[in-house]
């Protein structure tokens, strides 16, 4: 297992609709053809694999399970979007990148993006 640098923004504010997007960029030492990206949430004394995707370079990301994430890739960048977030989902979201093929296997873990989620205020009752 070889180390690899992964960069991601320090802070992101989710939209009022509970959507947060950020870029995860990795310094690929070689010509990887198969890449796995995992988003980890570190908060509340827990570490959770929020979503994971495997993709072949140049192709769409295929997320596993009932994913709340979507994403696209471009070169050594992955644009990740997490949906359905609420205030309680505020936390540190870490990007983990694995170069699966061809060998050697590379692993990179970012420092994390602190995602802040603010629940929208309910609209006041209207007479109209």
């Amino acid at each position: 297992c070889k180390a690899m640098h992964v960069a991601q923004p320090a802070v992101v504010l989710a939209s009022s609709r509970g959507i947060a997007s950020f870029v995860c960029e990795y310094a690929s030492p070689g010509k990887a053809t198969e890449v796995r990206v995992t988003v980890l949430r570190q908060a509340d004394s827990q570490v959770t694999e929020v979503c994971a995707a495997t993709y072949m370079m140049g192709n769409e990301l295929t997320f596993l399970d009932d994913s709340i994430c979507t994403g696209t890739s471009s070169g050594n960048q992955v644009n990740l979007t997490i949906q359905g977030l609420r205030a309680m989902d505020t936390g540190l979201y870490i990007c983990k990148v694995e170069l699966m093929y061809p060998p050697p296997y590379y692993l990179g873990i970012g420092n994390g993006t602190q995602i802040y989620v603010i629940d929208p205020e309910p609209c006041p009752d209207s007479d109209f």
Epitope: R41, D44, Q46, T48, E49, V50, C51, A52, L64, D65, D66, S67, I68, I82, G84, L85, M88, D89, G91
Partner: nanobody, 125 residues
Framework: EVQLVESGGGLVQTGGSLRLSCAAS????????MGWFRQAPGKDREFVAA????????SYADSVKGRFTISRDNAKKMAYLQMNSLKLEDTAVYYC??????????????????WGQGTQVTVSS
């Protein structure tokens, strides 16, 4: 709901290992996120680990990360908790639980509506 029965608990020395099993019956097992919780004497029940419906995504409490591994076999309707490097503070009754919901950011707070009867794990020095 599903019916859950745990097994595999027992007495083990510090640094030892145990594998807990959770057998499910009833509804479609693969529709449920599975979790393990524990309760030590005089303490509240706490989250240990959870696993997504297909088994691809996992969540762990910081206190067990790197020592415990959660897994599942949907064909056998089983969930497992492999516990290594056990510590005295791991002594508790361990419960498996099922939540009929997809994965998310906070599996510890999912609406677990099915619970097993628990299995005792005792770690001694």
């Amino acid at each position: 709901e599903v019916q859950l029965v745990e097994s595999g608990g027992g007495l083990v020395q510090t640094g030892g290992s145990l594998r807990l099993s959770c057998a499910a019956s009833g509804r479609t097992f693969s529709n449920y996120t599975m979790g393990w919780f524990r309760q030590a004497p005089g303490k509240d029940r706490e989250f240990v680990a959870a696993i997504s419906r297909s088994g691809n995504l996992k969540s762990y409490a910081d206190s067990v990360k790197g020592r415990f591994t959660i897994s599942r076999d949907n064909a056998k309707k089983m969930a497992y908790l492999q516990m290594n490097s056990l510590k005295l503070e791991d002594t508790a009754v361990y419960y498996c639980a099922a939540a009929p919901v997809p994965w998310g950011t906070r599996p510890s707070t999912f609406p677990y509506d099915s619970w097993g009867q628990g299995t005792q794990v005792t770690v001694s020095s």
